[in-house]
């Protein structure tokens, strides 16, 4: 998401307004342990990262705690004392919400309602995807709260469901990350199933000789 022309590629992720992860791919510094220095206020001194991400024994990122009132991350990545990249970023741009928690389903005739606990901050969409063995693609429905009803289902069919949380573009911009998907849950006739049959792929046309 954030790259430089100096052989350093940067990616920022802001997990659930709690933890910021900054990772780098330092192609110009293959055997160097780059250090990460940061602050959330321009007037503070830089802190050094205490939780590094390592790749093949070398630093490749940093995990740092943030609070919801922390908006701007000022950071510097250094090779020894030499800064190789310095930046300041609005960290909301890189939000990745947490996956839906406490997911539950309630069935009523030909509809199912998925609920989960809403996250504590605004500007989110809760997306449910579902498909039957007869669907080659996932169908999707989303709402502003984690109370999503999918209608016109066939109770005799087995349906797989999964859910995730997305940041609204209007609130956070277009470059955020959706949450990871919740576990897939399968339902048929209002009861859970271990799995549904795999979606049918259309038969390949026979080639005439």
């Amino acid at each position: 998401q954030v790259a430089t022309g100096e052989g350093l590629q940067i990616q920022i992720m802001y997990f659930n307004l709690e933890t910021v992860q900054v990772t780098w791919n330092a192609s110009h510094y293959p055997r160097s342990n780059l250090s990460f220095h940061y602050k959330f206020s321009r007037d503070e001194a830089y802190d050094q990262c205490t939780v590094y991400i390592l790749q093949e024994g070398h630093t490749s990122g940093c995990l740092l705690d943030a609070e919801q009132q922390d908006d701007i991350l000022y950071f510097s990545i250094r090779n020894g004392t030499h800064p190789v990249f310095t930046a300041s970023r609005w960290i909301f741009y890189y939000l990745k919400p947490s996956s839906p928690k406490q997911v539950s389903f309630s069935w009523h005739q030909d509809a199912v309602t998925l609920t989960c606990s809403d996250l504590s901050y605004r500007g989110l969409l809760y997306e449910v995807q579902y498909r039957s063995p007869f669907d080659t693609e996932w169908q999707s429905k989303q709402e502003n709260t984690c109370n999503v009803t999918v209608e016109d289902l066939d109770a005799e069919k087995c349906y797989a469901f999964r859910a995730r949380v997305k940041a609204m573009e209007d609130a956070y911009g277009p470059d955020t990350y959706p949450s990871d998907w919740s576990e897939v849950t399968c339902w048929q006739r209002g009861e859970t199933r271990d799995s549904c049959p795999e979606p049918r792929t259309p038969p390949k046309p026979k080639l005439s000789k």
């Epitope: 998401q1 790259a3 430089t4 940067i10 970023r89 909301f92 500007g123 911009g173 277009p174």
Partner: antibody, heavy 122, light 107 residues
Framework: QVQLVESGGGLVKPGGSLRLSCAAS??????????WTWIRQFPGKGLEWMGY???????YYNPALKSRITISRDNAKNSLYLQMNSLRAEDTAVYYC??????????????WGQGTLVTVSS | EIVMTQSPATLSVSPGERATLSCRAS??????LHWYQQKPGQAPRLLIK???RSITGIPARFSGSGSGTEFTLTISSLQSEDFAVYYC?????????FGQGTKLEIK
């Protein structure tokens, strides 16, 4: 729709101060999610973002100006203000107030005032 | 801060022709790049948000593209009212910064 009208510009002596006002109509400056900003345009036409004040009164300032400016607001008057001290000739510019798009302070500016000219000269 | 560089400084195009304006960021900014038009004596007006998203009331001949560090504003068929100065602005970096502008003039 929102209308923004700046006032308070004029001739200021070097070392002096200014207080610009921006009166908003058609929209409440306390509407959740919106941030209000001051942007100036130098005679050479370059644009510089100066700072924000949010619906929650939180402020952010351009590091290059932070020690010299204060942005405030008066909810009852639906107005925002820019106080700037220790003025220099290079502060001569047209000063605009503007509103951020919904989503807050981290995006584009969709409504602008007509601007007010500040000239710093002895 | 992120430096925004626009090119060319001046672009001369005939009415009815296509105009292509460029904006480069010194660091990658995803798609958080916005375009403005400014006519003499007026405030800037937002044309395109987030690199390619249209703004209500802006004619469809204005379009934007790009991501990362390279962005383009295209005006498909220039009208007389399109001759103005165009600015790009990045928003994920702090502070927000603008390009120096491209003046679009009649050829």
């Amino acid at each position: 729709q929102v209308q923004l009208v700046e006032s308070g510009g004029g001739l200021v002596k070097p070392g002096g101060s200014l207080r610009l006002s921006c009166a908003a109509s058609g929209f409440s400056i306390t509407t959740s999610g919106y941030y209000w900003t001051w942007i100036r345009q130098f005679p050479g036409k370059g644009l510089e973002w100066m700072g924000y004040i949010g619906y929650n009164s939180k402020t952010y300032y351009n590091p290059a100006l932070k020690s010299r400016i204060t942005i405030s607001r008066d909810n009852a008057k639906n107005s925002l203000y820019l106080q700037m001290n220790s003025l220099r000739a290079e502060d001569t510019a047209v000063y605009y107030c503007a509103r951020s798009l919904y989503g807050g302070y981290k995006d584009a500016f969709d409504s602008w005032g007509q601007g007010t000219l500040v000239t710093v000269s002895s | 801060e992120i430096v925004m560089t626009q090119s060319p400084a001046t672009l001369s195009v005939s009415p009815g022709e296509r105009a292509t304006l460029s904006c480069r960021a010194s660091q990658s900014i995803g798609t958080s790049l916005h375009w403005y038009q400014q006519k003499p004596g007026q405030a800037p007006r937002l044309l395109i948000k987030f690199a390619s998203r249209s703004i209500t009331g802006i004619p469809a001949r204005f379009s934007g593209s790009g991501s990362g560090t390279e962005f383009t504003l295209t005006i498909s068929s220039l009208q007389s009212e399109d001759f103005a100065v165009y600015y790009c602005q990045q928003s994920p970096g702090f502070p927000p910064t603008f390009g120096q502008g491209t003046k679009l003039e009649i050829k």
